[in-house]
Amino acid sequence: EVEKTACPSGKKAREIDESLIFYKKWELEACVDAALLATQMDRVNAIPFTYEQLDVLKHKLDELYPQGYPESVIQHLGYLFLKMSPEDIRKWNVTSLETLKALLEVNKGHEMSPQVATLIDRFVKGRGQLDKDTLDTLTAFYPGYLCSLSPEELSSVPPSSIWAVRPQDLDTCDPRQLDVLYPKARLAFQNMNGSEYFVKIQSFLGGAPTEDLKALSQQNVSMDLATFMKLRTDAVLPLTVAEVQKLLGPHVEGLKAEERHRPVRDWILRQRQDDLDTLGLGLQGGIPNGYLVLDLSMQEALS
């Protein structure tokens, strides 16, 4: 806290300019009017204040707006935003995407800070859903943003927003998140033709059910092994050897290198060995010829 002292004669600030960098902290406190600061916040960004001086300026704004800053001030905070705490930000009502962009720009190139996370949370809650423009903006600044959301939060993403998602935005998503995103992507891209559809849906296939993988196998998509390895094991297991061969096309040869890893390993265990042999890849571990396979889950369903 800076002590309350009278402003020395001739030092009262008439505008926010570079002369203020020569003020001591107590002089800034005494000589800068908070209302003037609020109306000229955009100038602060162009002045090389020390961090200690910025603390004083923040303190002045806090006194002027104890219930939280108005958006007209927030939009021009610039690097003073880095001085804000999550508690400060929770008092704000940020509705403009331009304001969000301006503040994200200040933090550009850094990890998502608690301040930024709180800001995004306030913004998205205020909007009610993650619309396309917001998602566009957030993933541009933080490619991993989407995968930082819980499945519950992802459920508020409208299918139209999925168009903004790039493959790298999904790199760190886990299966639970892809389970939520995949149906939205399927809906978003439903009017595209086969090859274009596959290009768009590919990144989301970690959430695809068996029936959709069977359908894709009929479309000559030539899925690469990296995508195949990210599929849900429970979705891959029911696929026949012929379906997997059609799904992977020329990439089917890659199964040999992955035969010890999920989901390939588990899928091999479910196939007849003579069916696997038709691939000519030397895959081992299938059900030996002459064995009868009982699907107990079907039996339970019938009884």
């Epitope: 570079e18 960004n45 162009a46 002045i47 090389p48 204040f49 020390t50 690097y79 880095l82 720009e105 200040v106 550009k108």
Partner: nanobody
Framework: LVESGGGLVQPGGSLRLSCAAS????????IGWFRQAPGKEREGVSY????????NYADSVKGRFTISRDNAKNTVYLQMNSLKPEDTAVYSC????????WGQGTLVTVS
């Protein structure tokens, strides 16, 4: 930002400090020189606008210090003449524009 040019100098002597930027272009940034003596508050010493057409100084250094910039070399200078013992401090530069950059400082000892 990296400062250099500090050192030990006798009262009445001169030094020229440099503030060089790497990884970004200084052209668009206003620059301030600051100093902090042991146990004292950091204080502003000098300022130069991004265009270089506006400069400003603390009362304590007016007429003795001169700030300038060479955008081609991505460097800002502080020429310090008629140095006094009370100028002893760590001098650091700061750039303000879209982002903020601070240097680690260079020690100036007048003794």
């Amino acid at each position: 930002l990296v400062e250099s040019g500090g050192g030990l100098v006798q009262p009445g002597g001169s030094l020229r400090l440099s503030c060089a930027a790497s990884g970004f272009t200084l052209d668009y940034y206003a620059i301030g020189w600051f100093r902090q003596a042991p146990g004292k508050e950091r204080e502003g010493v000098s300022y130069i606008s991004s265009s270089g057409d506006s400069t400003n100084y603390a009362d304590s250094v007016k007429g003795r210090f001169t700030i300038s910039r060479d955008n081609a070399k991505n460097t800002v200078y502080l020429q310090m003449n008629s140095l006094k013992p009370e100028d002893t401090a760590v001098y650091s530069c700061a750039a303000a524009g879209g982002f903020r950059y601070w240097g680690q400082g260079t020690l100036v000892t007048v003794s």
